[in-house]
Interface confidence: low
């Protein structure tokens, strides 16, 4: 019978860690000579297995090749790794007497695609917090997957974002691949509760994409709006001043009251009110004993937020000398912000 080497499968796909069978059958055992499996072609091809009884890690012959009538030279590769990817050839040799064995026929080859899952995506953002209306970049990285085809999508609060750049490396053929993608996000003051999500879909993930998440609360700073107001006096000798810092994030806040430029009270906020958008509010009360002030007094509320330059708001309380009614004091708010860069 004429010799024919048949590899029925043109390709097989196998998940990393699993086993795969590479089928090879012969129509004749003649001429006498060994059968060998190679990966690749040409001088650099790699001998994978020869049915000579030697031990090869992870590779077994499927049938008993020691039987005289055996025509099945299929092999099983166990615990496949991405390094096993390539085209495998079942090759028949004719035994030489004094000269080396001669290759006489090869199967058509079976390409092994190793399916390796991508690593969970890691999303990184800027080192410093950004402010509303600022554009910031986020990068998503995943590695170790095969085959090369992969889909990466960006979302912010459910809306898909278009990346600036997405690259899969290496560009040539390799055992496994890495993906890196960068997206640009414009921050807004409502973003404290927002998330940027990087979603990776791959053939190995069975329609369950992997997600990497960046909470924008880690990357945004919303500066407070600061207001000083005067409450109705509780008694004839007291003026109640209120300094309100509204809609700020993160929580780090220091508040100082000054009288005519001198520090009067340090207020370290403890009970902040949280808004539904994730920002915070804080109200500081300052009781002024009006009978102690015959002259005008400028009260200043100075707010330092997240190590940023201080925001100041002034409020002038007129002393008794200006008052026709000895039992009351007049006040003049001055709510224009002045920035103290010290």
């Amino acid at each position: 019978k004429e010799l024919k080497v048949t590899q029925p499968e043109k390709s097989v796909s196998v998940a990393a860690g699993d086993s795969t069978v590479l089928n090879c059958t012969l129509t004749s055992l003649l001429p006498v000579g060994p059968i060998r499996w190679y990966r690749g072609v040409g001088p650099s091809r790699l001998l994978i297995y020869s049915f000579a009884g030697e031990y090869v890690p992870r590779i077994r012959n499927v049938s008993d090749t020691t039987k005289r009538n055996n025509m099945d030279f299929s092999i099983r590769i166990s615990n496949v790794t991405p390094a096993d990817a390539g085209i495998y050839y079942c090759v028949k040799f004719q035994k030489g007497s004094s000269e080396p064995d001669t290759e006489i026929q090869s199967g058509g080859g079976t390409e092994v695609y190793v399916l390796a899952k991508p690593s969970p995506p890691e999303v990184s953002g800027p080192a410093d917090r950004g402010i509303p209306d600022q554009k910031v970049n986020f990068t998503c990285k995943s590695h170790g997957f095969s085959p090369r085809n992969i889909t990466l999508k960006w979302f912010k609060d459910g809306q898909e974002l278009h990346p600036l750049e997405t690259t899969v490396n290496p560009s040539g053929k390799n055992v496994s691949y890495n993906i890196s993608s960068t997206v640009r996000v414009v921050l807004n003051s409502m973003d404290v509760n927002s998330k940027v999500i990087c979603e990776v879909a791959h053939i190995t993930l069975d329609r369950s994409p992997l997600r990497g998440i960046a909470n924008l609360s880690n990357f945004i700073r919303v500066s407070p709006t600061v207001k000083v107001t005067q409450q109705s006096p509780t008694s004839m000798n007291q003026v109640n001043l209120t300094c309100r810092a509204e809609r700020f994030y993160p929580e780090d806040l220091q508040l100082i009251w000054l009288e005519n430029g001198n520090v009067s009270r340090n207020d370290t906020p403890k009970n902040l009110t949280k808004n539904t958008d994730g920002t915070y509010n804080y109200t500081s009360l300052f009781l002024v004993n009006s009978s102690a002030h015959r002259e005008d007094v400028v009260f200043t509320c100075q707010v330092k937020h997240d190590q940023q330059p201080a925001i100041t708001r002034n409020h002038t309380v007129l002393g008794f000398a200006h008052s026709s009614d000895q039992g009351s004091m007049q006040t003049f708010p001055d709510n224009n912000a002045t920035h103290n860069w010290n």
Partner: antibody, heavy 119, light 107 residues
Framework: QVQLQESGPGLVKPSQTLSLTCTVS??????????WSWIRQHPGKGLEWIGA???????YYNPSLKSRVTISVDTSKNQFSLKLSSVTAADTAVYYC???????????WGQGTTVTVSS | DIQMTQSPSSLSASVGDRVTITCQAS??????LNWYQQKPGKAPKLLIY???NLETGVPSRFSGSGSGTDFTFTISSLQPEDIATYYC?????????FGGGTKVEIK
């Protein structure tokens, strides 16, 4: 002849992260065909496989430790490393790195490094 | 996880005795089993891979056999330098798991 050498702090405080590095000499970590594993042994106890990494990316972790373990490889330094977060006294052990040929046996081991978790 | 049950946990034998250790897997692991020797204060050393293959440089008095769920490790003639703890390890399924070990002592 491939040789392995573990390095890292011998004392780690509870709740901190244990970080160890295994330096490979006598061969290239990126030559392929091998997994690089971490194994630990609690005092007077048996061996526990932590996880393994293939140079090009695939990583396998023991599910019992997966939430706390990170194994990574640095081919430029011919090293692979282990990070174990939120450690407790139960993580006190001798930590070994090993080379595993095609999952057919851990044929090369480091000498082991003792890590004690204590405040 | 695959459970590897090793027995006995310890044994004492005389120099020249034949020593046998068994290892049972909780499910079929084919021949994906290794045996290691660990001496006090030292790293484990691979002796047998794939159930019955002797690692290069390991004395021929060590041997392994078995397939499926039941495996045996044998020292045909115990030597003083064989005092150690011996472990089996499966690598058929992740995570790799070890037996509890068998401590071998000289009578």
């Amino acid at each position: 002849q491939v040789q392995l050498q573990e390095s890292g702090p011998g004392l780690v405080k509870p709740s901190q992260t244990l970080s160890l590095t295994c330096t490979v000499s006598g061969g290239s970590i990126s030559s392929g065909g091998y997994y690089w594993s971490w194994i630990r042994q609690h005092p007077g106890k048996g061996l526990e496989w932590i996880g393994a990494i293939y140079y090009s990316g695939p990583i396998y972790y023991n599910p019992s430790l997966k939430s706390r373990v990170t194994i990574s490889v640095d081919t430029s330094k011919n090293q692979f490393s282990l990070k174990l977060s939120s450690v407790t006294a139960a993580d006190t052990a001798v930590y070994y790195c090993s080379k595993e040929g095609y999952h057919s046996g851990m044929d090369v081991w480091g000498q082991g490094t003792t890590v004690t978790v204590s405040s | 996880d695959i459970q590897m049950t090793q027995s006995p946990s310890s044994l004492s034998a005389s120099v020249g005795d034949r020593v046998t250790i068994t290892c049972q897997a909780s499910q079929d692991i084919s021949d994906y089993l290794n045996w290691y020797q660990q001496k006090p204060g030292k790293a484990p050393k691979l002796l047998i891979y794939d159930a019955d293959n002797l690692e290069t440089g390991v004395p021929s008095r060590f041997s392994g056999s078995g397939s499926g769920t039941d495996f045996t490790f044998t020292i045909s003639s115990l030597q003083p330098e064989d005092i150690a703890t011996y472990y089996c390890q499966q690598f058929a399924y992740l995570p790799w798991t070890f037996g509890g070990g068998t401590k071998v002592e000289i009578k």
